[in-house]
């Protein structure tokens, strides 16, 4: 997490600061919507457990033409070590429930201030 | 001390404007979001407005969408909340208050500045 | 936007008295809820964070309960300092909504 950087501030951004901001933008779309997010698209429920971004960002990267997220998927993508591309699944997909963004967003924005509350920044 | 005062309100005419501030003392006001609510007179409270730490997120009530201006100066440990065309209805006591670090709602509050639009 | 509606508006109680104040919200808020106590002329001081979690150098006869729609103020003996009027604040969505206020007076 030491390469997180360029949501809020120029340079690296410590751990506990990069969650915070992804918290602020996930706050912010739950927010801010007027209409159904990413027009009700669905995507697969994760469980909330170790390696999390990872699969968030592998589910939420096969929503396209969202622009509602984007920023939510680019800070996603600066908490996982690999590279996900669309199409991509790992074990903590619960791959016979889908959900709708707005829902995932919701679970997901719960789950990490859970964590921030705990300490648990990586 | 944690410590946040408001100052600013006065006696303004409808269709006026003022601006109030709000200095933080006794923490880091940069690592916290910030709102301000008022109190009308005899009146329960209503949140008006709310800035993110960083200043990427702000958020207004709907009755002074457009017309109310939430801002801040981290440097200068300071909230601001400019007030345009301003009403009779705004007659209040403005407070500023601070967002708990761990989003738990508002923890400290200040002591609040009267705002007065009457003409 | 949420709605919170919060009763009694007011009661008349006698110190020593279990005093009980509702709030009701019109969607799931979860536990994003604290109570606030307001005496005339001051600012709002927070009681309770996180629907039942009682903030430092509150006294233990304040407690929250409830979650998701339906929540709870109980002052278990009330004191001659309690009397006050009571607030509950929702800060799941935004715009963020206080309840109307519970006036607690002398009976």
């Known amino acids: 997490l030491t390469c997180l950087g360029g949501f809020a501030s120029p340079g690296p951004v410590p751990p506990s600061t990069a969650l915070r901001e992804l918290i602020e933008e996930l706050v912010n779309i739950t927010q801010n919507q007027k209409a159904p997010l990413c027009n009700g698209s669905m995507v697969w429920s994760i469980n909330l457990t170790a390696g999390m971004y990872c699969a968030a960002l592998e589910s939420l990267i096969n929503v396209s033409g969202c622009s509602a997220i984007e920023k939510t998927q680019r800070m996603l993508s600066g908490f996982c070590p690999h590279k996900v591309s669309a199409g991509q699944f790992s074990s903590l997909h619960v791959r016979d429930t889908k959900i709708e963004v707005a829902q995932f967003v919701k679970d997901l924005l719960l789950h990490l201030k859970k964590l921030f509350r705990e300490g648990q920044f990586n | 001390e944690v410590q946040l005062v408001e100052s600013g309100g006065g006696l303004v005419k409808p269709g006026g404007s003022l601006r109030l501030s709000c200095a933080a003392s006794?923490?880091?006001?940069?690592?916290?979001?910030m709102h301000w609510v008022r109190q009308a007179p005899g009146k329960g409270l209503e949140w008006v407005s709310s800035?993110?730490?960083?200043?990427?997120?702000?958020y207004y009530a709907d009755s002074v969408r457009g017309r109310f201006t939430i801002s801040r100066d981290n440097a200068k440990n300071s909230l601001y909340l400019q007030m345009n065309s301003l009403r009779a209805e705004d007659t209040a006591v403005f407070y500023c208050a601070r967002e708990d670090y761990y989003y738990y709602g508002l923890d400290v509050w200040g002591q609040g500045t009267t705002v007065t639009v009457s003409s | 936007d949420i709605q919170m509606t919060q009763s009694p508006s007011s009661l008349s109680a006698s110190v020593g008295d279990r005093v009980t104040i509702t709030c009701r919200a019109s969607q799931d808020i979860r536990n994003d809820l604290g109570w606030y106590q307001q005496k005339p002329g001051k600012a709002p001081k927070r009681l309770i964070y996180d629907a039942s979690s009682l903030q430092s150098g509150v006294p233990s006869r304040f407690s929250g309960s409830g979650s998701g729609t339906e929540f709870t103020l109980t002052i278990s003996s009330l004191q001659p300092e309690d009397f006050a009027i009571y607030y509950c604040?929702?800060?799941?969505?935004?715009?963020?909504?206080f309840g109307q206020g519970t006036k607690v007076e002398i009976k």
């Open positions: 800035i993110s730490y960083s200043s990427t997120y702000i």
């Open positions: 006794g923490f880091t006001f940069s690592d916290y979001n």
């Open positions: 604040l929702q800060h799941n969505s935004y715009p963020w909504t």
